[in-house]
Interface confidence: low
Amino acid sequence: SAPGEDEECGRVRDFVAKLANNTHQHVFDDLRGSVSLSWVGDSTGVILVLTTFHVPLVIMTFGQSKLYRSEDYGKNFKDITDLINNTFIRTEFGMAIGPENSGKVVLTAEVSGGSRGGRIFRSSDFAKNFVQTDLPFHPLTQMMYSPQNSDYLLALSTENGLWVSKNFGGKWEEIHKAVCLAKWGSDNTIFFTTYANGSCKADLGALELWRTSDLGKSFKTIGVKIYSFGLGGRFLFASVMADKDTTRRIHVSTDQGDTWSMAQLPSVGQEQFYSILAANDDMVFMHVDEPGDTGFGTIFTSDDRGIVYSKSLDRHLYTTTGGETDFTNVTSLRGVYITSVLSEDNSIQTMITFDQGGRWTHLRKPENSECDATAKNKNECSLHIHASYSISQKLNVPMAPLSEPNAVGIVIAHGSVGDAISVMVPDVYISDDGGYSWTKMLEGPHYYTILDSGGIIVAIEHSSRPINVIKFSTDEGQCWQTYTFTRDPIYFTGLASEPGARSMNISIWGFTESFLTSQWVSYTIDFKDILERNCEEKDYTIWLAHSTDPEDYEDGCILGYKEQFLRLRKSSVCQNGRDYVVTKQPSICLCSLEDFLCDFGYYRPENDSKCVEQPELKGHDLEFCLYGREEHLTTNGYRKIPGDKCQGGVNPVREVKDLKKKCTSNFLSPEKQNSKSN
C-alpha cells in the first residue's frame, strides 16, 4: 500500500463556506431532451454543451438544438446557438473536437431530405466563431482528424465514398469509391478497405486493403482477401481469409503494409472474432474468440514484432463481436491490466496482471471487508470488479473502473468481495498502489472522479431520488466530507470534469422537474479554496511502485526496471496544481529468465522458466513456416519481453537454430499467395 498516515479523520477547515463561495449554478433555458458536453483543448476552460430536443410529429421528427459555451470550466455558459444559425445539430455525430490544443471543432447539421449534401459548422478558435460549409456529400461518419495535422479531415459518405479535406473542411475531394472502413495511420497516411462487387457486407473476406500516403494522389494495394483491419501502436493488423476454407488469420505489418508476416495465432471461423484489446509501440494484447457461442476466448500477448504470441489468459470474458469485455488498462501504474474470466461454473471472476499479461492473479481481498454469499470459505475470497459487462447487464453499477496517469497508483472501482462477481448492490473500492491492495472506500454505488492529480476525489451517490449532496476526500478516499451544493435537489445525470484529472473544478449535471416543465441545470464547484496552498517538497514522499517484498533486492522490478515516484502524502491538503508533472526515478534491474518469452518453436514446461524446444511444429505452425520470413525462423529460443529494459543478469544465449529444417509441409508454396501493388 502506498504511504499513508493512520490518523483519525480530520475535517477540512471551514469547507462549507469555502465551497459555497465557489459553487456556480447555471439553469439552461431548455426542455430536457438530451445533453452532450465536450471539452475544447487542454487547460483552456472551454466547454461546449449541445442540448437537443426531439418532438415526434405524425410524419417526421422535428428537432431543436441549442449550443452553449463556457470559458471558465463551466461556471458560466453563454448561448451561442445563433453562431450556428439556430441549426439542428446531429447528436449521433457528436462534436468533433480537434487533436491537442488545435481549438478546432466540427458540428454536423441535420439537413432536409432533398439536399445535395450535408452541412457542417467549423471553428478554429475554440468555438468563438463558426463557419458554415455545405458538403458535396452526405456524411456517414463523424469527421476524423489526422493526428499529425488537424487541417486534414476524412469522412465516409452514405454512398461509401472516401472524402478528404486538406483545409479543415473548407474544400472536399472524393479520393476513392466503394470504401468500407478508413483510418488515419501515422504520417498522414490513410488506410482503407474497398469492395469490388456488391457491398461491404457481401464482399467481407474479399475486400482489398489500400494505402495512400499523399492524401489520395497515389495508392497502393497492400492486402487482398481482407475481412477487416486494425491499427494498434506501431502495428497494422489485417484478418485475411484462408485459401482453402472460410477461416481467417491475422497478418501483421510494422512497415505500414509494405511487408506482412503471419501472426502465430489460431485461425478463426465465420462466427468467431479477433479483437485488439490494447496496443502500444512495444506489443499488443489480442483476444481470440473461442469457437461456438461461449462468450469467452483467449488473451494472447505479442512479441516486439507482433508475430509470436504467448497465451496470457484463458476463458477471457468477451461477449460476441463488438460486445462487452471488462478488459481495463490501469493507467495509473505501468504494466497493470484488469479483466474478467468466465469460470467453469459460469460465474464471473476478476483477474489482474501487474506485468503486462505475464501472470494473472485474483485481486487481494480488502482488509476491511467480509466475504459475501458467493464465497465457499468465508475467510478466503477475492475482490471482483464491476466493469463494462456488469453495466451492460444493467446491474447497479453507474461507472466503470477509473484510473488516471497523473494520479499515480490510484484505481477506483465498484466491486464485490467473494468468489465471483455478485449481482448484489456493489460498494466502491480504492487501491492506492495500482491494484495490489484494496480498501472499501464508499458504501453502495457512486459516481466518482479524480481532481488535481489525485489531491481530491469527488463522489456522488447513485440514487433514483433527487440529490443535493456531494462527497469529497483529500486523502485518497480514507476520510470523506459531505457538502450540500443546493437547497433544491436535482435528478442527477452526470459528473463532468476536465479530462486528465488536473482540474479542481467539477460540474454536476442534472435536471429539475416541476409540474409543467423540466430544465437542464449544472452546478460547478471549484475546490481551489479547499486546497489553499501549493504543495511543497515536504508534502511528497518516495514510493517504490510494484513493491511486494521490501527485503528483496529485485523488489519493484517489473519488465526489467523499477520506478520510484514522488507521491503526495495522504495527510497533505495542498494543490498539486495544473502544471503538476509526475516525478519518477527509474532504475534498471538485472535480467532473469522471467524477462524473456519463448520464441516460435519453443515453450515453457509447467513450473519451469526455461524455454524448451518443441519436438515438432504442429498444425497452423506449418503455415507460419510456409509464409514466415527467413529471419523469423532463426532463433535461440528466447526473445526479450516487449518493453523490458533489464540488463545483465541472466543472458539466455545459446546456439541459433534454423527452424526451416522442421518446416516440412505439403501446403501451397508461398508464391501462390495473392498480392498486388499499384
Epitope: 521490501p550 540488463q647 545483465g648
Partner: antibody
Amino acid sequence: QVQLVQSGAEVKKPGASVKVSCKASGYTFTSRYMSWVRQAPGQGLEWMGIINPVGGSTSYAQKFQGRVTMTRDTSTSTVYMELSSLRSEDTAVYYCARDPSGIALAGPASRPYYGMDVWGQGTTVTVSS
Amino acid sequence: EIVMTQSPATLSVSPGERATLSCRASQSVSSNLAWYQQKPGQAPRLLIYGASTRATGIPARFSGSGSGTEFTLTISSLQSEDFAVYYCQQARLGPWTFGGGTKVEIK
C-alpha cells in the same frame, strides 16, 4: 578461504585514468555481485557502484556516472574498476567488496541484505600533478 | 538517494562501558541495513547485517536493532580492540549509501 586481492598502489596525473583490479577466490565468482567503495583521506566510505559478474551489468552512483566503468573477466574471476578524467579529489583508497545481492533467476524471493561481507585490502590511488 | 545520518560523530567511552551508536535514514530502508567497523589502515569489517544479525565471527557484545528509519548499534562492554570508526549502510534502494561514521574513542 574467501579472498579479494586488489592491484597495487597507483600515482596518476590529473586528467589521466586508473584501472584497479580485484581478483576473487574461495567462492563461486558468479554467485555474488561486487561493489566498489572508496575512502578519501580522513573521510568516510563512499559507494561507487556495483557489477553483476554473470551478465556484466552495472549500476553506478550518479556522482561517478560517465567517469567510471566496471567490467569483469569470468575466466580469471576478476573485476575491474576504471576511473577516468582524474582530479585531485579522487585521491583515495579504493576497495572492492563482495555484495550479497543474489541473482534473481525467477520471480521475487525474500532475500535479506547480508552486507558486504568480504573486502579487498584496498588500492591507494594518488592524483597529483 | 537515501541519506544516512549517524550520531554522534564522536563518542568517548571508557573500556567496559556501554556504547550506543545511532543511524537514521531519510526514508524507510526496512531492515536492509548493515554496520561496519573500520580501524586505521584497514578495510572495513562487516559486523551486523539485516539490521540485527551478527556476521560470522562477531562477538556477542555487538548487537543491532531498529527497522524503517531508526537504527542502533550497541556495544555492551567496550574492549580495547573495539575503539574504531563505525559506519552504517543501507541497501534498500540504489545507490547504496553510507552514514558519515561514528568514531568511538577512549575516554
